[in-house]
């Protein structure tokens, strides 16, 4: 799978994580920090 950094317009897309662009799947993906979940890493869990 080809991945790259997200475009600059997606700055802030991932609330608590790193945004990566999955080129072949035509979508952005959030790699969440420890303790966070959700499509955009918006949920905190203990």
């Amino acid at each position: 799978v080809s991945i790259t950094k997200c475009n600059s317009d997606m700055n802030g897309y991932c609330l608590h994580g790193q945004c990566i662009y999955l080129v072949d799947m035509s979508q952005n993906y959030c790699r969440c920090e420890v303790g966070y979940t959700g499509v955009r890493c918006e949920h905190f869990y203990l």
Epitope: T4, N7, D9, G12, R40, E42
Partner: antibody, heavy 116, light 106 residues
Amino acid sequence: QDQLVQSGAEVKKPGASVKVSCKASGFNIKDTYIQWVRQAPGQGLEWMGRIDPLRRNTKYREKFEGRVTITADTSTNTAYMELSSLRSEDTAVYYCVRSGTLFDFWGQGTLVTVSS
Amino acid sequence: DIQMTQSPSSLSASVGDRVTITCKASQDIHKYIAWYQQKPGQAPRLLIQYTSTLQPGVPSRFSGSGSGTDYTFTISSLQPEDIATYYCLQYDNLRTFGGGTKVEIK
């Protein structure tokens, strides 16, 4: 199956406002950005602006600043584009477009006609 | 706002010809360019994103290339069903469409 269903065609008088809706099904708009694009008859595509429904953050093309308002109601999974002070040059098909989780998934378009 | 200058605005070519459309950005867009095909009365159809990634179901005669500010879209062998208007879109920093290229059969 993911869908963006837009409101029906509108006819407005110059100076009036129009509000076009874009209802999402099959996905949560909070996971995406919703863009708005328009196309006047026989003309090219023109990006108007976008909203991040989760953060309620908006960005607009400079030429539309002060005249366009993009909002989202996450409880109904619907985005809206309101354009005020309409003039004949605003006659166009208006499209909502999902981006973020999937590259550019388009609604069917809404024709807005501005005529006296 | 980033400006996208697309050329030519129209072209006429024969079936089987190689067709090339270019888009020049006013600043580096880091390969974040997409190409759309639009036929009369229809919504635009995404052909290519991230400069060269073909969408599922799009024929391999369509291709894209480029980097920095200069990008190219190519139809290697024009077919009658390719008659349409083609648009580039930069999506690095917000969004800007090129002016479009109307492709006709000679």
